[in-house]
């Protein structure tokens, strides 16, 4: 029986060009975490395997860094990074747990927004 729960950072926002840490935490179970997959929409970003360590998908190598812990750091954020992210915990003997995070990437600063709408 699956008794565990995934806690996530929930809905988060970050500035364009900056970085953000995606974090999930599995609690209320004694199951062993064998692997954690991180996905964005329909794409696999990275994997942390208990025996093998980290694997970052080649297309994200420049902008994704492993950790801290089982989390994932996204760097050089763009507006296109806005969307849903999923942590997928493969555990033994429980099975698979999933968590969802929604990231909104905002324009760099309020000042920048203000400048854009100034009347000449």
């Amino acid at each position: 029986m699956m008794t565990g729960t995934i806690e996530t950072t929930g809905n988060i926002s970050a500035e364009k060009g900056g970085s953000i840490i995606l974090q999930c935490h599995l609690s209320s179970t004694t199951a062993q975490v064998t692997q954690v997959n991180w996905e964005q929409q329909d794409q696999l970003l990275a994997i942390c395997n208990a025996d093998l360590g980290w694997h970052i998908s080649p297309s994200f190598k420049d902008r994704v860094a492993p950790g801290p812990g089982l989390g994932l750091t996204l760097q050089s954020l763009t507006v296109n990074d806005t969307g849903e992210y999923f942590c997928i915990y493969h555990t033994y003997p429980d099975g698979t747990y999933t968590g969802r995070i929604f990231l909104e990437v905002l324009e760099s600063s309020v000042a920048e927004h203000g400048a854009r709408f100034q009347i000449p």
Epitope: D42, Q43, L44, H55, Y92, P93, T96
Partner: antibody
């Protein structure tokens, strides 16, 4: 060159037991998860069992749980499948397969060993 | 348990044509899906892992894609050596399940 060679297949009566072996070579056996997959006479593929690289974790479908036991001897580079309380529906070609690192796909398969359960 | 529904069960096509085989999962299994090819009298061979990643040595005419719970294997410009059976397989909740298979035959 990666090689997986299965053996131990036979004709056995319903209720009987059989132990299959898979000899691995050409790779570091102790660092890979391994699986048994069978192909039924109607050509369907059925997953039978999986074991983690160190042997700590074993996985089975409900259809064989409690009847089949997967094990490994990393010192001998050998994978095993102990089958008991065999049924006619266990009749199949049994393949051992290696799992891709990080991904749960099976990247190398043996040639298979045939198991027939019939009275 | 998650069910994998593979379609079509069989397909009769000509060399040079493009075909798409699909597997639908009864729940979201994210990228935990692989595709295999099996030729008559041979063992299965992996084509695609993690839904979209081409295995080593697999020709680029093969491609895997995913949209939600639907997974597709596309073969562009079929060659004579591509005829055989194709299977999808998932890993989820500590279980591996194969689709029912698709038999690709020469028209």
């Amino acid at each position: 060159e990666v090689q997986l060679v299965e053996s131990g297949g036979d004709l056995v009566k319903p209720g009987g037991s059989l132990k299959l072996s898979c000899a691995a070579s050409g790779f570091t056996f102790s660092t890979y998860g391994m699986s048994w997959v069978r192909q039924t006479p109607d050509k369907r593929l059925e997953w039978v069992a999986t074991i983690s690289s160190g042997g700590s974790y074993t996985y089975y479908p409900d259809s064989v749980k409690g009847r089949f036991t997967i094990s490994r001897d990393n010192a001998k580079n050998t994978l095993y499948l102990q089958m008991s309380s065999l049924k006619s529906e266990d009749t199949a070609m049994y393949y051992c397969a290696r799992q891709v690192h990080y991904f749960y796909a099976m990247d190398y398969w043996g040639q298979g060993t045939s198991v027939t359960v019939s009275s | 348990d998650i069910q994998m529904t593979q379609s079509p069960a069989s397909l009769s096509v000509s060399v040079g044509e493009t075909v798409t085989i699909t597997c639908r999962a009864s729940e979201n299994i994210y990228s935990n899906l692989a595709w295999y090819q099996q030729k008559q009298g041979k063992s299965p061979q992996v084509l695609v892992y993690a839904a979209t990643n081409l295995a080593d040595g697999v020709p680029s005419r093969f491609s895997g894609s995913r949209s939600g719970t639907q997974y597709s294997l596309k073969i562009n410009s079929l060659q004579s050596e591509d005829f055989g059976s194709y299977y999808c397989q998932h890993f989820w909740d500590n279980a591996y399940t194969f689709g029912g298979g698709t038999k690709l035959e020469i028209k």
